[in-house]
Every structure is written in C-alpha cells, then in structure tokens.
Amino acid sequence: SGTTNTVAAYNLTWKSTNFKTILEWEPKPVNQVYTVQISTKSGDWKSKCFYTTDTECDLTDEIVKDVKQTYLARVFSYPAGNVESTGSAGEPLYENSPEFTPYLETNLGQPTIQSFEQVGTKVNVTVEDERTLVRRNNTFLSLRDVFGKDLIYTLYYWKSSSSGKKTAKTNTNEFLIDVEKGVSYCFFAQAVIPSRTVNRKSTDSPVECMGQEKGEFRE
C-alpha cells in the first residue's frame, strides 16, 4: 500500500496556556510527513500544518473560535514524497488526540503584579489583565473578558522581615489589603479558577516587595 515504512503518530499532547494552543506528538519523522486535522463534535474536520516535518502544530486559530467547545485533533502520517499513498483501510495512517476543552483546560499563565500603591495602612495591588488570543469584534480579549467571575486571583503577602504569609482573594484584578504603617511587605499573586477540576491554578507571579520601583507611597 506504500505505507510500509510509515508509522502512526503517538503521544499526542495538548500544550495550552492562556488559549495559545499547540498540539505536540512523536516520533520525529524519518521519511514521512504529517498533516493535522482538528474538529469540534460537529465532525467538520479542518486540515492544518500540511505535510509538515514538525512534530507540533499551532491550533490556536481554530480553538479561539469557540473556547467552550470540545476539540479533537488527529495527526495523519504520509510517506515523504508520496503523500497520495493510503493505508490498508483506504486512508492514511492517523492517530487521534485526547479531547480538549480550552475553557476548562488551558493553563493559566503566570500573572504579573502591575502596580501597588500604599495609602496609609492600605495597599492597593493590581494584577495585570493579560491579553489572550481570543478575539471578539476584531479585538483581543483579556483573561478577565474570557473567564469573567470564574477567574479569581489570590494574593500572598507577608512582612519582609518574617515568613508568615497572609492571603487575600479577589474576583476583579485588584486587592486592597491592610498593612502596618512603616513596615515593608512582599507579595505574589496566583490566578485561580475554583470551578475547574484540572489546571485550577497558575504558577506564582514574580515576588514584588514594597520599596521597589513598581510601588507608590502616599501618607
């Protein structure tokens, strides 16, 4: 059938952060090329990454069309130089990916503390609302635009001189925390989607401490 030396892809894996979504697979091709197809449950398969020797395919453009749909991808293997060749079932060898629902599964990217401002015994901490590749009306939506109140942030903060951490939560991107006057504090933030069963939390933001350039201080 011409597929004697063609092997099916395996270990198909979704890698997705803030909806930037790449399908990866093995093996590195030897005398073969790959084409990827992706579909929702509609079965309207769309081909991407035609006859590639890569072992990854960026499917972001497809999944951002509706991040709440569930997607399946499949990777077809063809002999290099003979892409018309088919397997014994009359079609090229292929393997299916696991199902992937971006809204429920994309990893939350590492947040960034955009600014903090102290006014007396209060500190207002703002977490950057990161832009995603999800579009609406030709503009890119932020993480908050996409997830709404499903997304919360947790702030961990502590006196620079001690290790005991306190926490605060917000379903906006801003925290207002109580601090002791004249005492320096450090903090980091984490994005969380409490309703999820997987990939609930992001990695921690870089630690920021009062007295560094991001802060403003007012009596």
Partner: antibody
Framework: EVQLLESGGGLVQPGGSLRLSCAAS????????MGWVRQAPGKGLEWVST????????YYADSVKGRFTISRDNSKNTLYLQMNSLRAEDTAVYYC???????????WGKGTTVTVSS | DIQMTQSPSTLSASVGDRVTITCRAS??????LAWYQQKPGKAPKLLIY???SLESGVPSRFSGSGSGTEFTLTISSLQPDDFATYYC????????FGGGTKVEIK
C-alpha cells in the same frame, strides 16, 4: 432532554425510493455530526452514513454508496436519508443517532421500519 | 475495512455473575472503540466510548478495557436489567460493529 424522532419508513417496492427524516431536540443540532445505523430483522447493527455538523462532510457504507444520500437542515433541526434504488436487503429498522466527531453514537432515536418487498 | 469479531455470540449467566465479553479488531484501532447495549425492540444505548470511558448515567458495574486489537466489556455483577445484546463498534476507520453478544438467563 435530548431526543431524536425518526419518520418516513414504510413498505416500498424494489427499485423504489423513500426519504427518512429525523427530528432532533434538546441540543444544538449544528454542533454535532449525525448518522444513520440500520438493523435488519434478527441481525446486528450496520452503519449506513454520517454527516458533519455543517453538512460539508459525508460518509457512506459501501453497501449504500451511490444509492443513499444523507443531508441535514440545521434551521429545522432535521436529518434526512434519501434512499433510492432500494433492494430487499435494505429492509431494516433505521436508527438516527447523534455522533460526536462522527465517531460513536451517544444518543439514538427509536427507529423507523423500512420494508422493501414486491 | 476493519472487521470486528465478538465472542461469545451467546452467553448464559445468572444474576450476580461477573460477565466478560470480548471484541477483536482485524487491525489495530488504538482505543477507538465503543460498547452498546440493546434490548429487544429498543434502540441501542451507549455504555462505553474510547475503550474505557463510561458514558454519563451508565452504572459503574460496566467497565471497558483493552487497546490495539483486543477489548473487553465487563459487567462486575450482572443485574436483571442487564440481560440484553451487546455490540462493540470501532471508529478508527469509518465505522463497523461487531456481530453482537446476547447475554441470556441461565
């Protein structure tokens, strides 16, 4: 509740035609591939045809290729199977089914009976 | 086409028995297999997809296993409602069903 209701079955002579319909409710019809599966009296299940959510992709079993046409009207939430050049061996209960990705059937209708006989 | 062979074609069992049905594919289908239950005069009902994923609402006494060419459907403790015919279906290349296994009362 997801429901599928077939209609259009009946008695037809060999060489005749019949159009089956399947009315869907309880889910976003265009979001799913749909299919037809048949079962001859006292026999097992046989896949007949599948259509993608947009209607742009269709697949047929060799036994019906060129004689049967699957279609859908998403505005009416209805799936169709146009059966031409019918043969005695097409006699069966025809089931309509919701088919995620066009792969497996997670919801089935109750079926409609087609009898091809002179 | 990929052929699916089920065994046994008929199985006699009693309530409470552990029942195993086998399905073999003529070539590797990875895990792309579904199991259905059908009662006389009724439509089939999906039990298992992707070889081992239990469909929502299906009792946990049903389980599926296997990959490649050999698959099993297991009913851990047969209940009166389980006497029926069971079909496997591959969806690796188009769709084909096994011939069915009738589970009857011993």
């Amino acid at each position: 509740e997801v429901q599928l209701l077939e209609s259009g079955g009946g008695l037809v002579q060999p060489g005749g035609s019949l159009r089956l319909s399947c009315a869907a409710s309880g889910f976003t019809f265009s979001d799913y591939a749909m299919g037809w599966v048949r079962q001859a009296p006292g026999k097992g299940l046989e896949w007949v045809s599948t259509i993608s959510g947009s209607g742009g992709l269709t697949y047929y079993a060799d036994s019906v290729k060129g004689r049967f046409t699957i279609s859908r009207d998403n505005s009416k939430n209805t799936l169709y199977l146009q059966m031409n050049s019918l043969r005695a061996e097409d006699t069966a209960v025809y089931y309509c089914a919701k088919a995620p990705y066009g792969y497996y059937m997670d919801v089935w209708g109750k079926g409609t009976t087609v009898t091809v006989s002179s | 086409d990929i052929q699916m062979t089920q065994s046994p074609s008929t199985l006699s069992a009693s309530v409470g028995d552990r029942v195993t049905i086998t399905c073999r594919a003529s070539q590797s289908i990875s895990s792309w297999l579904a199991w259905y239950q059908q009662k006389p005069g009724k439509a089939p009902k999906l039990l298992i997809y992707k070889a081992s994923s239990l469909e929502s609402g299906v009792p946990s006494r049903f389980s599926g296993s296997g990959s490649g060419t050999e698959f099993t459907l297991t009913i851990s403790s047969l209940q009166p409602d389980d006497f029926a015919t069971y079909y496997c279906q591959q969806y690796k290349s188009y769709i084909t069903f096994g011939g069915g296994t009738k589970v009857e009362i011993k």
